[in-house]
């Protein structure tokens, strides 16, 4: 008879035998035989394996290098890798978060549409008519122009996307 060519999902084929895979968090020490089960051992400190596997070595946990602006968001276990994120004011340069860059600031004339997170940069938008931003900031939104009318004043200088309107007193009519 032909030896097996396939095995069930939690098994692997070796020496014409279907052996049990090692559970997540454990590595393979020795393959099964007709009379002995697969031998597995837990991963060591700072190591992990996140799938049913036949790996003879566990993977090292990711190192969150503070020199690259990284810090630990979630500590790794024997079954999961460490998750890194960036220090305050910085964000990851990639999905794998291997290094960080400073959040960009929105220049005058632009306001913050979306504040940056540990994984995404600041999103800026141009200040529309009626709004302005006169600072370079990673937090400030566009501010509405001052309403001179509500203060019983008149516009002396029109606002721009970078400057607020300048209000002044209404001219008194001379008798």
């Amino acid at each position: 008879p032909e030896p097996p060519t396939a095995c069930r999902e939690k098994q692997y084929l070796i020496n014409s035998q279907c052996c049990s895979l090692c559970q997540p968090g454990q590595k393979l020490v020795s393959d099964c035989t007709e009379f002995t089960e697969t031998e597995c051992l837990p991963c060591g400190e700072s190591e992990f394996l996140d799938t049913w596997n036949r790996e003879t070595h566990c993977h090292q946990h990711k190192y969150c290098d503070p020199n690259l602006g990284l810090r630990v968001q979630q500590k790794g276990t024997s079954e999961t890798d460490t998750i890194c994120t960036c220090e305050e004011g910085w964000h990851c340069t990639s999905e794998a978060c291997e290094s960080c860059v400073l959040h960009r600031s929105c220049s005058p004339g632009f306001g913050v549409k979306q504040i940056a997170t540990g994984v995404s940069d600041t999103i800026c938008e141009p200040c529309p008519v009626g709004f302005f931003s006169n600072v370079s900031s990673a937090f400030e939104k566009c501010h509405p122009w001052t309403s001179c009318e509500t203060k019983d004043l008149v516009v002396q200088q029109a606002g721009t996307n970078k400057t607020d309107v300048v209000c002044g007193p209404q001219d008194r009519l001379r008798a």
Partner: antibody, heavy 127, light 107 residues
Framework: EVQLLESGGGLVRPGGSLRLSCAAS????????MNWVRQAPGKGLEWVSY????????DYADSVKGRFTVSRDNSKNLLYLQMNSLRAEDTAVYYC????????????????????WGQGTMVTVSS | DIQLTQSPSSLTASVGDRVTITCRSS??????LAWYQQKPGKPPKLLIY???SLEGGVPSRFSGSGSGTDFTLTISSLQPEDFATYYC?????????FGQGTKLEIK
């Protein structure tokens, strides 16, 4: 309630074809490996075929290899057995059965078993 | 292919008896063995998996033991509902195979 329901059985001439279906309900069908097992009248159980949860791995008993094809549609929770070139000795009740992997994380290896079975569908091959 | 041989093929016993059914494999299968109970006109029912683990909801009078090539199913005290046919199955490798069955009849 976890359930499997076979359909598609019937009387067919030798050399003919038949497609059996097995409708699954009450569990996440796409996460489980599945099997077809048959039982000829008054006889014992005979494993027929296996399919992995994704459908990419299949296996068959020597007695049906090259004639039967197992497949699945996870979006419809359906398991199929396409039976071609049928013979008199294929006459049996056909059961679909769910493979389950029993695992206790404190234990070493875990084990398989077929924990849910359909009621079966009768296939008669006769001229 | 792995052959499973059950003995005895049939067995007559009384309510309250202790009954043992054996299953021998043609090659070592470690503990990749399951036991099923089947009543006439019904599908099989899983009793034991991994040679010795009891499936949920199965009465504790059923027990399994063995590893390698020799396995046993024991019913410690037969109840009227236990009269049925019992099958062993190896899930070690494909093709998966069943024993020929043991018919347990009432004396």
């Amino acid at each position: 309630e976890v359930q499997l329901l076979e359909s598609g059985g019937g009387l067919v001439r030798p050399g003919g074809s038949l497609r059996l279906s097995c409708a699954a309900s009450g569990f996440t069908f796409g996460s489980y490996e599945m099997n077809w097992v048959r039982q000829a009248p008054g006889k014992g159980l005979e494993w027929v075929s296996y399919i992995s949860s994704s459908g990419e791995t299949t296996d068959y008993a020597d007695s049906v290899k090259g004639r039967f094809t197992v497949s699945r549609d996870n979006s419809k929770n359906l398991l199929y057995l396409q039976m071609n070139s049928l013979r008199a000795e294929d006459t049996a009740v056909y059961y679909c059965a769910r493979d389950v992997f029993f695992f206790d994380s404190s234990g070493d290896n875990g084990a398989y078993g077929m924990d849910v079975w359909g009621q079966g569908t009768m296939v008669t091959v006769s001229s | 292919d792995i052959q499973l041989t059950q003995s005895p093929s049939s067995l007559t016993a009384s309510v309250g008896d202790r009954v043992t059914i054996t299953c021998r494999s043609s090659q070592g299968i470690r503990s990749s063995l399951a036991w099923y109970q089947q009543k006439p006109g019904k599908p099989p029912k899983l009793l034991i998996y991994g040679a010795s683990s009891l499936e949920g909801g199965v009465p504790s009078r059923f027990s399994g033991s063995g590893s390698g090539t020799d396995f046993t199913l024991t019913i410690s005290s037969l109840q009227p509902e236990d009269f049925a046919t019992y099958y062993c199955q190896q899930l070690n490798s494909f093709p998966s195979t069943f024993g020929q069955g043991t018919k347990l009849e009432i004396k």
